[in-house]
Interface confidence: low
């Protein structure tokens, strides 16, 4: 009679994480008598997966009834597969022996590959806000996927970005992988409503990529532009001066009026108006009693935006001239080096 052969017909089996893997194995003969064992890996470090004779293997079930005398099908099913289960599985026939059974013949092995979905990409931006024209970095991370092949793309408002660097770790073989990507994005003044998107495509996602997003509203700081104007007189000795604070983001803003360098009033932006691009406008006014001043008055509107160094704009009020003659004078005088006007 021909010697027993152990047949593992599947060279490889591909299973999605969470599913059940079927590993097929048949023997060509009932002789010699002895049990079958399944191992992951070969050699002295191999891991026992199933022993027909003894032991408790809660995740393993046999395809056929191994208690039947004429059974030659030793296929098994392994439930709730995870990436850690990947490897080569061997069906090994043992010959009954005393005191221990002796390994008789092994199948050629079946490689189990596990497909695992990547986790939802997490996008994180810089710790501190940045102003338009600056380049900021965003990172995107996704974990736990297998096989290693994966595609990552970056978008800003639907436009694909090209300036990014991606790593898939570990570089060698592993049961599952992680991807880490850093993209560089140049901010513009219109980016308050913008979004950065990281898109991950993987074989397990069946053409429906995963996306992670970051809102640039959490990253951008748009500094205000200031304009100080003098309004027509309300009364004989009173002049109304307004400070228009335009196109700023975020809303956190404090304004101080100075008369000849002395603090006159400080207020915090509250009832702001929102522009279409997401930035804000605000206006503050100061009623100046001209008769209280003997000399010309230098009025300064000083703005501290989002904790940044103050920017200011000044206006000269000439007391010597009659207030009514100044009613339509809107000329604003720039201060020196501390002025920031971006129109």
């Amino acid at each position: 009679e021909e010697e027993l052969q152990v047949i593992q017909p599947d060279k490889s089996v591909l299973v999605a994480a969470g599913e059940t893997a079927t590993l097929r194995c048949t023997a060509t003969s009932l002789i010699p008598v002895g049990p079958i064992q399944w191992f992951r890996g070969a050699g002295p470090g191999r891991e026992l997966i199933y022993n027909q004779k003894e032991g408790h293997f809660p995740r393993v079930t046999t395809v056929s009834d191994l208690t039947k005398r004429n059974n030659m099908d030793f296929s098994i099913r392994i439930g709730n597969i995870t990436p850690a289960d990947a490897g080569t599985y061997y069906c090994v026939k043992f010959r009954k022996g005393s005191p221990d059974d002796v390994e008789f013949k092994s199948g050629a092995g079946t490689e189990l590959s596990v497909r695992a979905k990547p986790s939802a990409p997490v996008v994180s931006g810089p710790a501190a806000r940045a102003t338009p024209q600056h380049t900021v970095s965003f990172t995107c991370e996704s974990h736990g996927f297998s096989p290693r092949d994966i595609t990552l793309k970056w978008f800003k408002n639907g436009n694909e970005l090209s300036d990014f660097q991606t790593n898939v770790d570990p570089v060698g073989e592993s049961v599952s992988y992680s991807i880490h990507s850093t993209a560089k994005v140049v901010l513009t003044r219109e980016d308050v409503h913008s979004q950065v998107i990281c898109e991950v495509a993987h074989v397990t996602l069946q053409g429906d990529p995963l996306r992670g997003t970051a809102n640039l509203s959490e990253t951008i700081r748009v500094p205000p532009t200031l304009e100080v104007t003098q309004q027509p007189v309300r009364a004989e000795n009173q002049v109304n001066v307004t400070c228009q604070v335009r196109k700023f983001y975020p809303q956190r803003l404090q304004l101080t009026w100075l008369e000849n360098g002395n603090v006159s009033r400080t207020e915090t932006a509250s009832t702001v108006t929102e522009n279409k691009d997401g930035t804000y406008n605000w206006m503050s006014w100061l009623l100046v009693n001209v008769s209280a001043h003997r000399d010309d008055v230098k009025l300064t509107c000083q703005v501290e935006h989002d904790g940044q160094p103050a920017v200011s704009k000044s206006h000269d009020l000439k007391v010597s001239a009659h207030p009514k003659e100044q009613g339509s004078n809107t000329a604003a005088e720039n201060t020196g080096s501390n002025e920031r006007n971006i129109y």
Partner: antibody
Amino acid sequence: QVQLVQSGAEVKKPGASVKVSCKASGYTFTSNAMHWVRQVPGQGLEWMGWIKAGNAEIKYSQKFQGRVTITRDTSATTAYMELSSLRSEDTAVYYCARGDYYYYYMDVWGKGTTVTVSS
Amino acid sequence: DIQVTQSPSSLSASVGDRVTITCRASQSISDFLNWYQQKPGKAPKLLIHAASSLQAGVPSRFSGSGSGTDFSLTINSLQPEDFATYYCQQSYSTPLSFGGGTKVEIK
């Protein structure tokens, strides 16, 4: 036995390019990666990049991106590393080293090629 | 990028001493850490791969341990031929990176 034989020492002027070769023998060339590592005199080891000899997949260190080119010729079982726009700080010993595909350790090293950049 | 910090940068020891060199990675790298020995004018030589696996032909007085971020190389009973510079290298993520080296000198 497994051996990596590197090309001889080079003296180059700033702005020039250098191409170092690494001839492998004693193993299946396409079964491993080939790393390039350099060592500036008196300093530590610095990884430049690798090429997977089987499929020619290449990875460069960001520091050398744009200046380094790693190639291989499977029929000659030889890997090459070309560094362009040389400057004096590129004066170093350049090593090729065979890389494992799992842990990416470097188990066999060439003797090194000294590249001197001087005007 | 993963930084690998090696300590000490140098040490003096006598023949027969037990020497330990440590290596710390800036993030978890599992067991993807390798150790090399380099003598002046020579190429580095692989001692240990995968944190603790002794490379074929390397004397058993060398041993490696650790996982995650903290690793160590121990030389039991230092021999005259062991005076050299030792480097650790992470191979978890590109760019692959080496520690700054530890020079083991004769006391």
